[in-house]
Amino acid sequence: ASGSASGSASTLVHNGTSARATTTPASKSTPFSIPSHHSDTPTTLASHSTKTDASSTHHSSVPPLTSSNHSTSPQLSTGVSFFFLSFHISNLQFNSSLEDPSTDYYQELQRDISEMFLQIYKQGGFLGLSNIKFRPG
Amino acid sequence: SVVVQLTLAFREGTINVHDVETQFNQYKTEAASRYNLTISDVSVSDVPFPFSAQSHHHHHH
């Protein structure tokens, strides 16, 4: 098959700062760009960002989070809890462009969802969201 | 419809699964008016870390 897979990286971004938790093998993606699209869990950014021609996003980054030795624990060694969230948006139609972060539909929906979560979880503990994936309902 | 799957990160000890879901459900009406997103079928669960690159794709409803 064409292409070679890279690792995936989860970039958590909140109010312009990012905390990157990178799985192994490390992806070549960075918090500043669309991820390597061979990753099956594309990095997504939960902050207000400026779209450019290269579809790069501009954030100030903080050092990467490191993983705990306790793989069954839902925390990082730096004290982060992760939650998986799934929901339906019944008044939108899925289409194939929602599989690609460079499309307008993907970016608009991602932006709305990111802003929405920043509104919902305003309290100090919210660090951001990552690994947005869209699929048909 | 569109199913959205994602991972949320919080500082440890600031929130639990129940509160994540409750706060999200409380916001659904505002989401409809502010973002024109009609949200339903909300599901929240803990994600162990380090989670695999494919972890959240197994949660199909």
Epitope: A1, S2, G3, A5, I34, P35, S36, H37, H38, S39, D40, T41, P42, D53, A54, S55, F94, N95, S96, S97, E99, D100, P101, S102, T103, D104, K133, R135, P136 | Q54, H57, H58, H60
Partner: antibody, heavy 117, light 107 residues
């Protein structure tokens, strides 16, 4: 390593149907889309349609609507493209290409379909 | 449908040459453009996604850029393994469409 393995070459008569399969391996989940593309001998590439594996969601190129049917079998991690009412100009190599964080990331090796009387 | 006009249809070049291939979109497609490489008898391989992002494992001599609705693939120093046919692909809107291809041959 991600692989898309397509079924073998087919020879069909005009008016018949052909069903090409595209089996995915090298990853464990089935949440992604498959695009189908064809290439006639010595020609360029032409998009046929798209299916999101494990759902009934499809998109078709109007040019093929009514003659092409895209289906999938999640348990077998396989997508299928069936083209009916074959004519000589359908002689082509048919490719599947799966999404992986973006569209057209990985391509199958291709299946040659020859339509001849 | 969005038309992708690719030029040139073929070119002859030598190892070490700088090669540029252009695709013009008939309407705005943003950055939703891929570049593919195809060798005879083989499946296409994606080199560049989202106009300018290099796929994993693709040499850095390949690059992509955009000016308005014109999209360019550049090979900074042509290598023997680069002799192939190159296609652009727009995925801004369905039906997705390809450029006609550019065959890069040895001079």
């Amino acid at each position: 390593e991600v692989q898309l393995v397509q079924s073998g070459a087919e020879v069909k008569k005009p008016g018949a149907s052909v069903k090409v399969s595209c089996k995915a391996s090298g990853y464990t989940f089935t949440s992604y889309g498959i695009n189908w593309v064809r290439q006639r001998p010595g020609q360029g590439l032409e998009w046929i349609g798209y299916i999101y594996l494990g759902s009934d969601y499809t998109e078709y190129n109007e040019k093929f609507k009514g003659r092409v049917t895209l289906t999938s079998d999640t348990s077998a991690s396989t997508a299928y493209m069936e083209l009916s009412s074959l004519r000589s100009e359908d002689t082509a190599v048919y490719y599947c290409a799966r999404s992986a964080g973006s569209l057209f990331a990985y391509w199958g090796q291709g299946t040659l379909v020859t339509v001849s009387s | 449908d969005i038309q992708m006009t690719q030029s040139p249809s073929s070119l002859s070049a030598s190892v070490g040459d700088r090669v540029t291939i252009t695709c013009r979109a008939s309407q705005d497609i943003g950055i939703t453009l891929n570049w593919l490489q195809q060798k005879p008898g083989k499946a296409p391989k994606r080199l560049i996604y989202a106009t300018s992002s290099l796929d994993s494992g693709v040499p850095s001599r390949f690059s992509g850029s955009r000016s308005g609705t014109d999209y360019t693939l550049t090979i900074s120093s042509l290598q023997p393994e680069d002799f192939a046919t190159y296609y652009c692909l727009q995925y801004a809107s369905s039906p997705y469409t390809f450029g006609g291809g550019t065959k890069v041959e040895i001079k």
